[in-house]
Interface confidence: medium
Amino acid sequence: LQDPCSNCPAGTFCDNNRNQICSPCPPNSFSSAGGQRTCDICRQCKGVFRTRKECSSTSNAECDCTPGFHCLGAGCSMCEQDCKQGQELTKKGCKDCCFGTFNDQKRGICRPWTNCSLDGKSVLVNGTKERDVVCGPSPADLSPGASSVTPPAPAREPGHSPQ
């Protein structure tokens, strides 16, 4: 015999108290798959969290963070304060990137500058705390008599991660 609950679509639950009728999920709850015997409680985006996507009968709410904070963890399980570009967040607060590293966002860690020589290229623009180095043509390409080299386009300003 087929389980009658298998006919209950997402957004409903199989109500054992009502002869296994498919009942709509109550307010502030959802079921994202069919055949559910209960609906799950919607996530509430409170405090430093804000609602990115409202809960519906078939999908949970999604949160991000209020201004000045950004998400951490799967599904934005935590919010932490923004730092400035050129910094990273440590246990002692936001700290400037060490020489040789950069961070072009208000979140995340400082990363080492690109080592242009590993690709046989030269440094065209020096790196800063906020920006990676820009690698140029290889030193051989710049030797006298070499064919002219079209300078690379300016590096695109990187966008911030979604907040």
Epitope: C45, V48, T66, Q81, L89, G93
Partner: antibody
């Protein structure tokens, strides 16, 4: 306990720059942001901007070209500068701490009245 | 900018009355609303954040509710020290904005 205290000149001439200092105690500057809010006499509250623990700033776009917020961690001080002031900038100016729980203000200074007049 | 419209702008009440102040946002702000109390000549004091969470030390007679665009601050039994002006504030997006205030006066 947590304390914030605003200080600065009570009278500023039109077209000059208003400069205020907020001296704080009782909490760590590496963990908390500080907002500046003003209140013209007999009117409501207006948010000016915030400086976060790492030094990043966010400003009210209506004032963005005129306002600068900075901090000196070694002195436990925050500063507000508002350039090209007019009589409309006459107000009580408050600094207030941002908690770790939301983008709000949980502790406020007592406020300082700044009058713009020649 | 998100406009926060408070009503009424003033109201009179007696000690022991139940009082409700409302705040309407011009667009959905989730539950990212705070309430402040301000007495004459004093700085504002935080009462509620996240629409319904009382700040530490705030008496239980103060409660907040609402989500989306409509929010309320309720004082279940007004005490003499509650006569003040109350402001709502949204922090869902920049710029942070306040309501125009509601002045609670003694009847």
């Amino acid at each position: 306990q947590v304390q914030l205290q605003e200080s600065g000149p009570g009278l500023v001439k039109p077209s000059e720059t208003l400069s205020l200092t907020c001296t704080v105690s009782g909490f760590s500057l590496i963990s908390y942001g500080v907002h500046w809010v003003r209140q013209p006499p007999g009117k409501g509250l207006e948010w000016l901007g915030v400086i976060w623990s790492g030094g990043s700033t966010d400003y009210n776009p209506s004032l963005k070209s005129r306002v600068t917020i900075s901090k000196d961690t070694s002195k436990n001080q925050f500063s507000l500068k508002l350039s090209s002031v007019t009589a409309a900038d006459t107000a009580v100016y408050y600094c207030a701490r941002n908690p770790l729980t939301a983008t709000v203000m949980d502790y406020w200074g007592q406020g300082t009245l700044v009058t713009v007049s020649s | 900018d998100i406009q926060m419209t408070q009503s009424p702008s003033s109201l009179s009440a007696s000690v022991g009355d139940r009082v409700t102040v409302t705040c309407r946002a011009s667009q959905n702000v989730g539950t990212n609303v705070a309430w402040y109390q301000q007495k004459p000549g004093k700085a504002p004091k935080a009462l509620i954040y996240s629409a319904s969470y009382r700040d530490s030390g705030v008496p239980s007679r103060f409660s907040g509710s609402g989500s989306g665009t409509d929010f309320t601050l309720t004082i279940s039994s007004v005490q003499p020290e509650d006569f003040a002006t109350y402001y709502c504030q949204q922090y869902n997006s920049y710029p942070l904005t306040f309501g125009g205030g509601t002045k609670l006066e003694i009847k």
